[in-house]
């Protein structure tokens, strides 16, 4: 029976340009991880296999960089970013868990778009 | 328990459309994964064509993008395929499945013939 | 697109044989790499994904390995039941894809 829970960072936004960490954890379960799938509902970019180390997808490989721990950092954002990014956690013996963020990159911050409207 | 049915003619004649359509039953489409057709000619080759996820994004096989269109049916818990300007090239068993991250086609229809022949 | 390979399109056993299948992709896929079983007037059934993982109920003489472009299925003991074609699939990005099919035959 499957017990255990994952825990994402949800809905998460950040600007054009800088870099966000995907991240999940896999809970209440004693299942042992043995891989960890990044992925968009159409390809793969990243996997975390517990004997074969990282594998980054070429179409990533410039702006992924795994880590922290089973998370994933992607850097230089671009607004073709957003949408949806699922960790697919391979456990033994429980099977397989998805857990599921939505990602929002923004043109740029509020900061800057209320110094754009400063009276001088 | 989750099955998916196909349904739909067997006979289309050339330069005509071709419409499936795929209920679901035992999960709701909108919950969750990828819901898929496929199609497998009569050599056994199989041809992933597209899908539409839960939310109602689609994604088309290159090979057929001008031609295919894969909407659904909420309320019906359905979801369709429909194919432009088919020719005999296009007969072929037709399936739905369902694709699930990190795995593959999890469930699949029984499958329908189409033929396309005048 | 991600071309997968299976070299051979049949293979000849015996009930209790040991039988392997080979599928290579044209590109390094990781592990992405399902197995589906086809018998004859049926719909593929998923036995393996992500290289080695078995489905629920899924037989334990039914194994997978590989990882990068080389894959392999194994029988370990050859059934009646197990006649079949066996399919390969990559789903390591779009347009997901099929190798073409290996026919198990029982001498």
């Known amino acids: 029976m499957m017990t255990g829970t994952i825990e994402t960072t949800g809905n998460i936004s950040a600007e054009k340009g800088g870099s966000i960490i995907l991240q999940c954890h896999l809970s209440s379960t004693t299942a042992q991880v043995t891989q960890v799938n990044w992925e968009q509902q159409d390809q793969l970019l990243a996997i975390c296999n517990a004997d074969l180390g990282w594998h980054i997808s070429p179409s990533f490989k410039d702006r992924v960089a795994p880590g922290p721990g089973l998370g994933l950092t992607l850097q230089s954002l671009t607004v073709n970013d957003t949408g949806e990014y699922f960790c697919i956690y391979h456990t033994y013996p429980d099977g397989t868990y998805t857990g599921r963020i939505f990602l929002e990159v923004l043109e740029s911050s509020v900061a800057e778009h209320g110094a754009r409207f400063q009276i001088p | 328990d989750v099955q998916l049915q196909e349904s739909g003619p067997g006979l289309v004649k050339p330069s005509q459309s071709l419409s499936l359509t795929c209920t679901v039953t035992g999960y709701s489409i909108t919950s969750d994964y990828a819901w898929n057709w496929i199609r497998q000619f009569p050599g056994n080759k199989l041809d992933w064509m597209g899908y539409?996820?839960?939310?109602?994004?689609?994604r088309y096989n290159p090979s057929l993008k001008s031609r295919i269109s894969i909407t659904r049916d909420t309320s019906k818990n359905q979801f369709f395929l429909r194919l432009n300007s088919v020719t005999t090239e296009d007969t072929a068993t037709y399936y739905c499945?369902?694709?699930?991250?990190?795995?593959?086609?999890?469930?699949w229809g029984q499958g329908t013939l189409v033929t396309v022949s005048a | 697109d991600i071309v997968m390979t299976q070299s051979h399109k049949f293979m000849s056993t015996s009930v209790g044989d040991r039988v392997s299948i080979t599928c290579k992709a044209s590109?390094?896929?990781?592990?992405?790499v399902a197995w589906y079983q086809q018998k004859p007037g049926q719909s593929p059934k998923p036995l393996i994904y992500?290289?080695?993982y078995r489905y629920t109920g899924v037989p334990d003489r039914f194994t997978g390995s590989g990882s990068g472009t080389d894959f392999t299925f194994t029988i370990s003991s050859v059934q009646a039941e197990d006649l079949a074609v066996y399919y390969c699939?990559?789903?390591?990005?779009?347009?997901?894809?099929f190798g073409g099919g290996t026919k198990l035959e029982i001498k």
């Open positions: 499945a369902r694709r699930e991250l990190g795995q593959g086609f999890t469930y």
């Open positions: 539409i996820t839960y939310s109602g994004d689609t």
């Open positions: 699939q990559q789903h390591y990005s779009v347009p997901w894809t």
């Open positions: 992500s290289a080695s």
């Open positions: 590109q390094d896929v990781s592990t992405t």
